[in-house]
Every structure is written in C-alpha cells, then in structure tokens.
C-alpha cells in the first residue's frame, strides 16, 4: 500500500503535486508499512477495541487563515476517555478518585509503556530497532525523552505527508510559500504503541485557508456608545478604530504597514502607519467605512526582465505580475502581487487586506455634568439619613433614564444602585434626589441613558454628620 491509499481520498492533480512542495514533507506515493501500522477502514469493528475504556478523540485546529508565504500551525490534541490522562513518563494512567462507568480502577495504568519499552527492545543500547520506525520506514528521531512519546501522528495534505512522534498533543508548522491559494484539507491519522507494532486510534480532518489577502479585523469603540457591537455610533463623539491583523506566525513583523481609510462622509482619504485612528462623524446617517491595509512582505523575486532592444527604453526594475487567484480585487493599483526588486535578490511583495463596514450615526447623549449638590433638610424621625439633590445638565440628545450607583470612596464596592425613567425638557436640566445612610465619603456614579447612548459622570462627596452647621462638600469631580 502507498500513503495515499491509507490517508485520504483527495487526490491532487499532478500540477498541484508539483507546485505545492512543502519543505520537509514527503510524497504520498511512498510505501506504507502495513505490518507495523495496520490500516482499518471506517466502520471496521477493530476500532472499537483500539483503546482501553472507550474511544480516543483527536481534535485538529489551525491558526488559519494564513497569508501566503507565512507559516500555518496545526495542533492536534488527543482527548482520552473519562478518568484517563498521560503521566509525566508518557504512560496513560487512571486519574485518582475518578469514577467512570467501570467504577474505580485497581490498576493505576491504562497503558504502561515504560514497562514495555524496558523489556521488549533488544536494541543493543542504541535505542534503534526494526520497530522504532515511522510508517515509511524512517527511524524515530532520538530527542531526549523520545521513549516517553507513544503516539505517532501522520499529517497529510496536498499529496504529501509528515510524520511526527509525540505525546498527547503535538503541533506542526508548515510554510505556505508554495501552497495554492484557497481552502485546503489537512488530514491526521494517529497511532499508539502496541508492543512492537502500532494501532490506529483516531483520524481527524480540517479545512485550512491560504490567502493572498491580509486577514484584517477592525474593532470600534466610542465613549457613551451603549452597544459597541451593533455598528451604530453617536454623532459628534470620536470613534476609535483599532486594526487587528491576523498574523500568528509574525510574517509581517518586519513589514512596513500602511492603513488607508475612507470614512464615507466626504472627508477624503486618511493614510496612516498607526493601527489605531480616531474619527468623528458630524452628520447623522449611514456611512460606508473602507480600509485598505498594505504591507510590504518578503517574497520571491520576479524573473529578470528580458534584455532591452536597442530601440526601446530599458524596462523599469519594478515588475507587476497579474494575480489570477486574488479573491477580492483591490482598488486600482492595489494588485496583491506587486513585486519590487531590491538589491541582492531579496524582494518584497505588496500584500493587501481590505475591511468594509456600514456604520449608522445617530444623536446621542454626549456629556453629563453635575453642576450643583444640595443637602435637603430631613424631618426629625430620620436623623441618620441625608437627602441630597444633584442638579445635572447634559448635551446632545434627551435622556430617558437616569441611574445612580453609590459606592465606597474607591468606587469599587457598590452599596446602592437606583435607576428611574426621566422626563427632561429641551434644556436638559434635571434634579436627581438620592438618600445616603450615614455620614462619610461616597463615590457617586451618575449615568444618563437613551436607546443608543449612556453618558457617565462621577464625583466623590463628603456627607457630614447631621449637624446643620456642617456644609455638604463635593470632594472632587
């Protein structure tokens, strides 16, 4: 049998095989050692008994999407049946005081591989023997601790495979420089040691994506905005836009990155090298936000231009290649495969990423201020309580609710929260009356809200003893 007979039904074309050479991977045309590594079809009854106490689940994840040329990392985690775990020496043991369907186990081991390897090797002290090999016959690498690594992982994609000896989690990184753009399939088969052979215990597959577009996300934040995820924001207050580039392998670390913003409100283009920008919309309405991110990334050099004919001018050193694989064409001049030749054959490719969002701008409460506080004289029966009137003004739209949160002087431990609807005139002047139990210093957070906004002001107040001569003090605002 060959690797492709064992590992997957997806057969890439000859073109794909030739053009997707992965560094350190081998062709799946190689022979698979079925004596050491038996092959079971899906549904084979032997899967039922491949692991003591249940089935092992393999979870395959990746940090896809990957910008072409960057590294993509795949991680496989084995999930053992309940109450089982891997110990420090790579043996699979039952967790102490853990009860599964079979009850508490007397034997601490599910698989005691240490015992097997110590008495079954016959390796003349070299650690090498005919069974310490991968499915293609290559010997296991002799990392320190390799004897505690009891799982064999075979990764398979694009007509190639990669073998790795490991423990209950492994990770493999692949450079995507030669990978065709678009979605690809990664399949992983996992075997465990079984005496002098191996037994399959899990198979898993996952789709990953290689793209020539920089994966871009934008977070938006605005003070007083009630719901930051609904893309509705307030007029006359700055919105902070923060660009996050998905680049887990740090491929773009040494790239110059430019951000080109169009806010859709006729304020023109704004170009920056900073990943955060503030913008204030001064009109209500719906606006189309567009961002183009440009990064000069390391890339292959174009073929040298043909020698010039005497009658024509010398072609420029900047060569532009047409890209047929780009998912979303950028604006004019934003070709994803624009190459510039620089000395000593290190070249750069301009890569682009795009983000578009529709933003709705509405009126909101822009500001709230406490302009006055008055101690209201209480009738005699409540000598311990103080009634205080807060006179509050606001700017922007008219609030529909007011909340006060009274807490300790550090503003951390809430003592009392009261919310109530309010009916405010156009001048936006209102009086909020609150009770304070006892003298002392309090932190007062006062918020005015409507459907789309929530404006806050805070103050520390000092409530005196109930002595008419003691004035009420605003500690600071």
């Amino acid at each position: 049998k060959r690797f492709h007979d064992v590992l997957g039904n997806e057969r890439p074309s000859a073109y794909m095989r030739e053009h997707n050479q992965l560094n350190g991977w081998s062709s799946d045309e190689n022979d698979w050692n079925e004596k050491l590594y038996p092959v079971w079809k899906r549904g084979d009854m032997r899967w039922k008994n491949s692991w003591k106490g249940g089935r092992v689940q393999a979870v395959l994840t990746s940090d896809s999407p990957a910008l072409v040329g960057s590294n993509i990392t795949f991680a496989v985690n084995l999930i053992f049946p309940r109450c089982q775990k891997e110990d420090a020496n790579g043996n699979i043991v039952y967790e102490k005081n853990c009860r599964n369907e079979a009850g508490l186990s007397a034997d601490p081991y599910v698989y005691n591989w240490t015992a097997w390897s110590e008495d079954s090797d016959g390796e003349n002290g070299t650690g090498q023997s005919h069974h310490n090999v991968f499915p293609d016959g290559k010997p296991f690498p002799h990392h320190p601790g390799w004897r505690r690594w009891n799982f064999i992982y075979v990764f398979h994609t694009l007509g190639q495979y990669f073998q790795k000896l490991g423990r209950c989690s492994v990770r493999v990184s692949v450079n995507t420089a030669n990978v065709t753009l678009g979605p690809q399939l990664m399949e992983v088969t996992v075997y465990r040691r079984h005496g002098r052979a191996y037994v399959p215990i899990a198979q898993v597959k996952d789709v990953y994506v290689v793209t020539d577009q920089i994966p871009v996300f934008v977070t938006m934040f605005q003070k007083n905005d009630r719901n930051s995820s609904d893309e509705t924001f307030l007029k006359d207050l700055p919105i902070m836009f923060d660009v996050l580039i998905h680049d887990p392998s740090h491929f773009l670390n040494y790239s110059t990155i430019n951000y080109k913003w169009s806010f859709g409100d006729n304020t023109g283009l704004f170009v920056s090298t900073n990943h955060t920008v503030n913008h204030t919309y001064v009109l209500n309405g719906t606006f189309s936000l567009n961002l183009t991110v440009k990064a000069a990334a390391p890339g292959p050099c174009p073929p040298p231009p043909p020698p010039p004919r005497p009658s024509k001018p010398t072609p420029s050193l900047a060569t532009t290649l047409k890209s047929y694989d780009s998912n979303t064409p950028g604006p004019a001049g934003d070709n994803p495969l624009e190459l510039s030749r620089i000395p000593d054959e290190n070249c750069q490719i301009n890569r682009y990423g795009h983000f578009q969002a529709t933003i709705t701008i509405v009126e909101g409460i822009l500001e709230v201020n406490i302009i006055q506080m008055t101690d209201v004289l209480m009738p005699v029966p409540w000598p311990e309580s103080s009634l205080i009137d807060f006179v509050v003004t606001c700017q922007g739209s008219i609030p529909t609710e007011v909340c006060t949160i009274i807490s300790d002087p550090t503003c951390e431990i809430t003592q009392n929260t009261v919310c109530s609807p309010v009916d405010v005139d156009e001048m936006c002047l209102l009086t909020v009356r609150r009770t304070f139990n006892g003298s002392g210093t309090y932190c007062v957070n006062l918020t005015l809200g409507d459907d789309t906004s929530l404006a806050l002001t805070s103050t520390l107040i000092s409530v005196p003893d109930r002595d008419p001569a003691s004035p009420l003090r605003m500690a600071n605002s």
């Epitope: 991680a75 650690g127 320190p144 601790g145 690594w149 209950c168 989690s169 990770r171």
Partner: antibody, heavy 121, light 104 residues
Framework: QVQLVESGGGVVQPGRSLRLSCAAS????????IHWVRQAPGKGLEWVAV????????YYADSVKGRFTISRDNSKNTLYLQMNSLRAEDAAVYYC??????????????WGQGTLVTVSS | LTQSPSSLSASVRDRVTITCRAS??????LAWYQQKPGKVPNLLIY???TLQSGVPSRFSGSGSGTDFTLTISSLQPEDVATYYC?????????FGGGTKVEIK
Amino acid sequence: QVQLVESGGGVVQPGRSLRLSCAASGFTFSNYGIHWVRQAPGKGLEWVAVIWFDGRNKYYADSVKGRFTISRDNSKNTLYLQMNSLRAEDAAVYYCARDPFDYGDSFFDYWGQGTLVTVSS
Amino acid sequence: LTQSPSSLSASVRDRVTITCRASQDISNYLAWYQQKPGKVPNLLIYAASTLQSGVPSRFSGSGSGTDFTLTISSLQPEDVATYYCQKYNSAPLTFGGGTKVEIK
C-alpha cells in the same frame, strides 16, 4: 537573545500564598516546555514543576504536588507559579528554565536570574 | 544521583574529574551544569558527552548507563564553581548533590 526574567518573590508567612511570574523574550515561547527549579540557600538544585509548550500537561515534584500550580500565557510570553500553603522548606531562589524541547522532558538550556522566596513567621 | 566528591581543591592547570552515579540505567540521558558563586546555573554538557555551544573545550563528559564523568582538562581560575549532574531519562527530573571546585 533568549531572556527569562522572574518576579513576584518576597517575604511571606507560612500557610500564605505567593505568585511568581517569568517573562520570556528572544525565542518563540509557545514552542518550548518551561520548568521551575528552586535552590534553598546554600543547598543544591531541586526541580519543582514543568509545563508543556501548549500548557496542556503539567507535572510536579512530590514535595509541591497539590500546593503549587504552574501555568502559562503564550499570548503574553509569560510563565507563572502559584504557590499556596507555603512552608518553611519552600524558602528558596526560584528559577524559571527553558527546556530545549516542547514537552519539557529533558534538560535546561537557559535560566532566569531567579527570584527569592522567604517563608517566615 | 550520587555525585562525588562533594568538594575538591586543585591547582590551576590540573586535570579535574567529577563523577555522577545513577541508581539505575539512564542510558546517556545526563546533563552537567556549572554554577558560579552568586550566579545562575549554566548548561555545560547534555546527552552525557555533547558540549553545549559556547562552552570551552576543556570541559568534556563521558559515560553511559549508570556511571558518568565530567572532566576539566586544565583547571582555570574562572572554573571555581559548584557542578551539578541531572538525569532526564524519566520523571521526575533530578539533580546530583553538587561538587564544589576550589583552587588550591
């Protein structure tokens, strides 16, 4: 260059807790197993705990099992050691040390400068 | 892991030998560290005999199974330190008790 910088040591009473941190730089932190090793004043080296490259598995010396917890945050390139129910015999300089391999099965190729933990009533 | 001697005193340019004995076969899974006074341990040798890069060639390691040796072929003043062996064939990882090397 590879750097490991420990912090969080100090004087603590028996039975109390302390959290040590180790900030890593100069290498791809998420590819390596990392250990805590301690050294009591004037004494030899003692291995304390190890955590795998991905944080999945953690192993401890019998002397600290159930009291100490090793953890890591790969996004912050930081290793932690939460030490609870501290005893007089836990007083030592605590080093974080990198294992050259992902599972922390082997030896220590880079060490931090250490942070001193004193347990005293 | 038993290290011997626990301390030694030798002259500059002397050949110095430190031994480390394991209670069971650990193949070649042994490392050696140097710790200078008031400093951090430093890896000298791993896999019993492989010199860590940057370590002077006067240091060498040998042995396999249960008996291991660290040799300093020509002792230098800067070699004053405590030397530790460490096994890593299986968990837990353990250190020898240390050998303190001084100059006569």
